[in-house]
């Protein structure tokens, strides 16, 4: 299969900026490349086909170029409607592989997350499972790392993250990380902690609780 690699995965920009997204194919696809724009909850919209041909109705600020293995999509002057995720797709072979996407986000000022930790509810414990939630509120940029520690032992593979869409008012994100354990495992341990790192924080922030004391 032909693999498609897009970069960057996130592009921070302001209205009026010129932005360029790159797509590389693992082997030559001539000019059999399309670009799509997708907004949350909506179907992808075709912008460009055959690498540089503008789909009807698409503004001329979208410019496609390239052939062989290297392709670019340029937005000459970014407009408010252009904040979205962009995908390239090759259609040289039957697999019609997509790139992993580039999210064009609103460039904000750096904001460190406010961090909160929540123990499982008594109601949930009755069901035999325990979910501990670490909430990161109103941060920018989106890259943040959450590490879970149980009695100071690092946890891996038993947590899931969910990130909100960028807030239209202040350009920030919020994130929840959920550590899921069986009730039996939860009750074997005492101290539950989430450690957060983010570029707005000079040092990691840790929030914790002692089971049975909250």
């Amino acid at each position: 299969d032909i693999q498609m690699t897009q970069s960057p995965s996130t592009l921070s920009a302001s209205v009026g900026d010129r932005v360029t997204i790159t797509c590389r194919a693992s082997q030559s696809i001539n000019t059999w490349l399309a670009w799509y724009q997708q907004k949350p909850g909506k179907a992808p919209k075709l912008l460009m086909y055959k690498a540089s041909s503008l789909e009807s109705g698409v503004p001329s600020r979208f410019i496609g170029s390239g052939s062989g293995t290297e392709f670019t999509l340029t937005i000459s002057s970014l407009q408010p409607d252009d904040f979205a995720t962009y995908y390239c797709q090759q259609y040289n072979s039957d697999s019609k592989m997509f790139g992993q996407g580039t999210k064009v986000e609103v460039k904000g000022t750096v904001a460190a997350p406010s961090v909160f930790i929540f123990p499982p509810s008594d109601e949930q414990l009755k069901s035999g499972t325990a979910s501990v939630v670490c909430l990161l509120n109103n941060f920018y940029p989106r890259e943040a790392k959450v590490q879970w520690k149980v009695d100071n032992a690092l946890q891996s593979g038993n947590s899931q993250e969910s990130v909100t869409e960028q807030d239209s008012k202040d350009s920030t994100y919020s994130l929840s990380s959920t550590l899921t354990l069986s009730k039996a495992d939860y009750e074997k341990h005492k101290v539950y902690a989430c450690e957060v790192t983010h570029q707005g924080l000079s040092s990691p922030v840790t929030k914790s609780f002692n089971r049975g004391e909250c």
């Epitope: 970069s7 960057p8 996130t10 921070s12 790192t197 570029q199």
Partner: nanobody, 126 residues
Amino acid sequence: QVQLQESGGGLVQAGGSLRLSCTASGRTSSIHLMAWFRQAPGKEREFVASIIWTGGTTYYAGTTFYGDSAEGRFTISNDNARNTGYLQMNSLKPEDTAVYYCAATSLENPTRYDYWGQGTQVTVSS
């Protein structure tokens, strides 16, 4: 390991300018992001600005970020050939008086500041 050394601090009048430098040595190829923080007496360390030094999969190298206090007045840049980052500070105010620290994250831990300089004093007089 990466070592960071700041320079360029000093005394300046309100409305004036200063350029701070941060020179990196050691395993500089492992730097992902270089940032400037500042700390005024009795206050917490505050984020000022950052620049993506080595592009990972997320942002292009050269992408810049600013804190509220710096936006519009300060400019962060870097010169990879010289392994040096810069903070150009214009329209300085007395409230910009602080110790300015250079910090860096690694490609392995891109959101954690594992490397810090010793700091350089900036004093803005009215």
